[in-house]
Every structure is written in C-alpha cells, then in structure tokens.
C-alpha cells in the first residue's frame, strides 16, 4: 500500500490507478477530474478590508465605505468584543490585546468612536469628540519576538532561537523553499515555489529547527496563491499554506508579524535575510545549516536602472542587498522572509527572484508584503 500511495493515485468511478505524477498537471486524467482537485488554488485579491493597523503604535484605522476615507479609532467605549471583531475582519482567530495610546501631534486622520454592525466595525453615527484623547492600539496576535537577537555581521550560521518563524517547505522530503509562520495555521511563502509541483499531497512543512531534515514534517491542507497576471508574471509571487493541524508555539516555533499597511522602508534601512539556499550561484548545493545575513533596502530607481533590472521591478516588489554585492538570497531561499525589526520582527518581503545571486547591480528582488495585506486578510477570512 505504501508503494501504491507513493507512486499512484486512485480514481473513482470506475476505480483505477493513475501515476501520481499526473496529479495536478492541468489535464483531467480521472473521469470525474478528482486528480485536479487537491491542487494549488488561486484566490482573487478581493474587496478592500475595512480595517487596518498603522505603524504609528499599531493604531487601528477604520474605512468609511461610503466616502472611501479612513478614520482613526477613538478609545472611547472600545471593548474586547470590538477588538475581536476588528481582528476577525483581518482573518485572525486568536485573542487580541489592545490598549489606549495618546493621540499624537502628527495625527492626520479624523478620530471617531467605533461601534459594530453585522460583525464589522463601523463609525458611530453621532460621534462627538474623542473624550479620552486616546487611540486604540491593537495587536491581533503575539508575534515577532525571538529568544535571541542576531548580531550585525555579513553572513553567518543562524540559530532557530533567532528566527523561530522560519520553516523549510519540502516536496517529497526535499527542501524547495523557505517560509514564515504567520499564525498557528498559516505559513507565508512564494507562489513560484509551487510552479513545478501543484499537488498539495506531497508538500510538507518543517518547523522548529535550523538544520535541514532534522525535524518532523507537518501535513499541508491547502496551498493558495493569487491569480497570475499575464502582463506582470513576476508580480503576485506570494502564497499561503494552510497546515492540516495548528502549530503549538514554543521557543523555537513562533509567528513573525505582518508589516503595517504604511510600512514604507527608505533606502539603506537595515534588513535581514535567512535561508538554506545555495551559498554560491553555481554551487549547486543547499546549505545544511540555516544561514543569516544583514542587507539593506536598495532604492527601486537604482534597482530598475539600465545596468540592473531595466524596469522589471514593479511597485509590488522591493530590492534588498548590499551596494557592492556579494550578500544575497539565492536558489532555495525563495519564499523565505526579508525581515525588519522595530519593536517586533516584521516580514516585509518574500524572497522572490533575481538574475544570478549576489551581483552588485542585480540584488535580490522581494515580494512587498504590505502590497498584499488585503489579499492575506481575505484568504484568512474565507478560511475562518
């Protein structure tokens, strides 16, 4: 039976086996098409999620759908139930925490009192002044905290204590891509990781170790990508993997935070990359040990120059590396996080693509996660 399961798939009506390699190949090999059912699925970008969190102390903002304007949430009469509703609107199922933070001098949005209507936050109609003088600072999930802070050096071996959200995404027990834990059910990675193998069955996630192959594998229930854009085929390089069973968090298994919607990182901002990928462009071999490196944001204009990517880097991507080259992600690092540390660690980018590895004019190109927050929230909500 083990051999049969490994190499064959059972079609129903009539019962017969087909080679497993015909699963999710885009061709209907079973009479009822069930060989194309448990495959990578695409999910549209969907409607705007009407709540968001700002980098200004994780303050809650609410959309007035009638006008398209955003408002900051006043702390007056804000309750745990409203906090849960806000987080549910973003697809979180965990218990949130919230607190009052003073309205700052740079507050540029109108501040309104919040209420709830059919499981969505709304602005209170007769909203007077914000008497508390405070905004709502909301955290939907405890995230982005590690046991150990990395040292700022070029490239060195990494410890899972520093990066407890890093996972290895494997097909048939072979490491293919990196990924990041976002919550107990969800792992963030790159869509292109699943281009060659689109059957969900053979994909596994390994979490909790910095060594390849030394930790138990977790079954995957779903792999979700965004609809492919024919004009910009390198855009939308983002995927969410739903685990069959929720993770139990520990010192070595923890989630990283999503970025804030307004997380604009200026050129030269320090960032971190990690992965088990090739250590040389033509090295032809994955690293057995997790490696980490410090890099920095590279200006998109520079990245799109004639001697670099010639306009191929879109607004939904970002470049990172070091100006002189030599420190970069490479084959096998795809899907892993590009990370920024403020109070917590945030996954601001996903290792996506590049020409070669480590070239001075062609740094790594990363999916800009803040451009896809709406999509992530919509996927999570649909799967709640």
């Amino acid at each position: 039976k083990v051999i049969l399961d490994k190499y064959y798939f059972l079609c129903g009506q009539p019962l017969h086996f087909i080679p497993r390699k015909q699963l999710c190949d885009g061709e209907l090999d079973c009479p009822l098409g069930e060989d194309e059912e448990h495959c990578v699925k695409s999910f549209p970008e969907g409607p705007a999620v009407a709540v968001r969190l700002s980098k200004d102390r994780s303050t809650l903002q609410v959309l007035d759908s009638a006008t398209g304007n955003w408002f900051s949430a006043c702390f007056d009469n804000f309750t745990e139930a409203l906090a849960e509703t806000a987080c549910r609107q973003m697809g979180y199922s965990s218990k949130p925490t919230f607190r009052a933070v003073e309205i700052g001098p740079d507050q540029d949005l109108d501040v309104v009192e919040i209420t709830e209507n059919s499981q969505e936050l709304r602005m209170r109609n007769s909203s007077g002044p914000c008497l508390s003088g405070s905004l709502v600072s909301l955290h939907c999930l405890a995230c982005g905290k590690s046991l150990k802070t990395p040292r700022v050096v070029g490239v060195e071996e990494a410890s899972v204590d520093s990066w407890p959200w890093q996972v290895s995404i494997q097909y048939d027990k072979q490491h293919v891509c990196g990924g990041s834990i976002l919550d107990p059910h969800w792992v963030l990675t790159a869509a292109h990781c699943f281009r060659k193998h689109t059957d969900v069955f053979n994909w596994k996630v390994r979490a909790g170790s910095d060594k390849l192959g030394s930790f138990p594998s977790l079954a995957v229930a779903k792999i979700i990508i965004i609809e492919f854009n024919p004009m910009y085929p390198k855009d939308n390089d983002i995927a969410l993997m739903k685990l069959q069973f929720p993770l139990t968090f520990s010192g070595t298994v923890r989630p990283i935070c999503l970025p804030f919607f307004d997380e604009e990182l200026t050129p030269a901002t320090p960032l971190w990359i990690i992965g088990w990928g090739f250590t040389k462009q033509n090295g032809g071999k994955m690293s057995d040990i997790l490696l980490q490196a410090s890099v920095q944001v590279i200006d998109s204009t520079r990245c799109n120059a004639d001697d670099a990517y010639q306009g191929e880097v879109t607004e939904k991507m970002m470049c990172a590396g070091i100006p002189e080259g030599g420190v970069d992600t490479c084959q096998g690092d795809s899907g892993g996080p590009l990370m920024y540390q403020s109070d917590q660690w945030h996954v601001v980018g996903i290792v996506s693509w590049g020409y070669g590895c480590g070239g001075p004019s062609t740094p790594g190109v990363y999916t800009k996660v803040s451009a896809y927050l709406n999509w992530i929230y919509n996927v999570w909500k649909a799967e709640l």
Epitope: A190, R195, E227, V351, S352, W353, G354
Partner: antibody, heavy 126, light 107 residues
Framework: EVQLLESGGGLVQPGGSLRLSCAAS????????MSWVRQAPGKGLEWVSS????????YYADSVKGRFTISRDNSKNTLYLQMNSLRAEDTAVYYC???????????????????WGQGTTVTVSS | DIQMTQSPSSLSASVGDRVTITCRAS??????LNWYQQKPGKAPKLLIY???RLQSGVPSRFSGSGSGTDFTLTISSLQPEDFATYYC?????????FGQGTRLEIK
C-alpha cells in the same frame, strides 16, 4: 487529450460584429491564462488579447483596444472574443492559445503558448 | 514595444542540411525568447522557450541559443517534416511580439 476548438468566424461587413468562441477540453481550463493570436492572409502572427485565469486581468493590442473584448466562462471551459466595429484589416485566422509560465532559475518565469486551436477565419469585407 | 526581426525571410535547404535562423530584438530581452513552427493551414507549435529550452515532445535536432538581443534557432539535420515557417517571439515584456517569420523550403 488537450484540445482547443475555435468557432464563430465568418464573413462580416465593415463596422459589423462577431463573437468568437474557443472550447477547451482535456485540461483544467480555470488554471490557465489564455490568449487570442491572429494571422492575416500571407502574413505573420500578431498577439491580440490575453486574459488571466479568473478574468481579473485583461490585456489588448493597441490595434484592437476599445473594439474587442476578451472574456471567459470557466464553468463552460470556454474563451470568447467579442469583436465590434470590425475593419478590413481585422481579416485573419484567429487562434486561441493556452499560456504557460514555467519556472526558471531563482523565481524567474518563462512564458510560452503551448496549446493552440486550429483557428477560425474572420473575413471583413463589403 | 519591442520589435523582433528575423533573417533570412526565406531559405531553401535539403534534407540532412544544418540550418540556422536568426532573430534580433530591438532591445535586450535577456533569454526571454520562444521559437514556433507553423505548417501551411495549421496552428503554430511551440518548439523552444527561454531561448534554449526544448518544449517536451520536440526532437533534439532543434536547438536554440543566444541572449540579450541576438538569438539563433538551429536544426542540426533537416528532416522532410521540418519544412515550415518559423517564428520567434519575445516573452520579455507585453505585448509579446513575434518576428515576421522565416519560410524554410525544400531546395
């Protein structure tokens, strides 16, 4: 067997309309972006329009923009091209094609049209 | 938009010959180039993608080379079924434009 079958071509007067259909079979139609390509008599190939798998993205050649509309019905495994305000220069064989994007080194994509229909002829003449 | 220019526009050769068709892009397209074969009254068929990669089911006598702006399709030993028109297509940026074609005839 993977197949695309176009229909709907014919003779139409300048300024008239036609709707081309392309029926897909043997593959998961809803997973693929699709395109229309045309070939005028004795001429080369010209890309006309493309549509993404769930219709979120639609693109057109400048020569047909505003006159042609691409659409698809994934429940019927069918691609369409609605052609309005037809001109003599739209006379061609129209092919539908399946778009593939295969993964290269380090996340780079390579594009091609790997499955084509047999074509349907559109003649615009008075 | 990127323009693609093929040469020659037609050529005559015999069975067993080695044949080379070239394609030039108006700007650099890295290796984002496809080659198609089309026989009279038939739909085009994808032969080579990414400049050098053979599409599955295509005989190994077909090969592609080049990068940047200059590309070549080579047929190492012509077979009777290879007489057709060949098109290059850039797949670097929309719209994905085709060359004007090269007609390969029996000498």
């Amino acid at each position: 067997e993977v197949q695309l079958l176009e229909s709907g071509g014919g003779l139409v007067q300048p300024g008239g309309s036609l709707r081309l259909s392309c029926a897909a079979s043997g593959f998961t139609f809803s997973s693929y972006a699709m395109s229309w390509v045309r070939q005028a008599p004795g001429k080369g190939l010209e890309w006309v329009s493309s549509i993404s798998s769930a219709s979120s993205y639609k693109y057109y050649a400048d020569s047909v923009k505003g006159r042609f509309t691409i659409s698809r019905d994934n429940s019927k495994n069918t691609l369409y091209l609605q052609m309005n305000s037809l001109r003599a220069e739209d006379t061609a064989v129209y092919y539908c094609a399946r778009d593939i994007y295969s993964s290269g080194w380090r996340g780079y994509y390579y594009y091609g049209m790997d499955v084509w229909g047999q074509g349907t002829t559109v003649t615009v003449s008075s | 938009d990127i323009q693609m220019t093929q040469s020659p526009s037609s050529l005559s050769a015999s069975v067993g010959d080695r044949v080379t068709i070239t394609c030039r892009a108006s700007q650099g397209i890295r290796n984002d180039l496809n080659w198609y074969q089309q026989k009279p009254g038939k739909a085009p068929k994808l032969l080579i993608y990414a400049a050098t990669r053979l599409q599955s089911g295509v005989p190994s006598r077909f090969s592609g080379s080049g990068s940047g702006t200059d590309f070549t399709l080579t047929i190492s030993s012509l077979q009777p079924e290879d007489f057709a028109t060949y098109y290059c297509q850039q797949a670097h940026s929309f719209p994905y434009s085709f060359g004007q074609g090269t007609r390969l005839e029996i000498k």
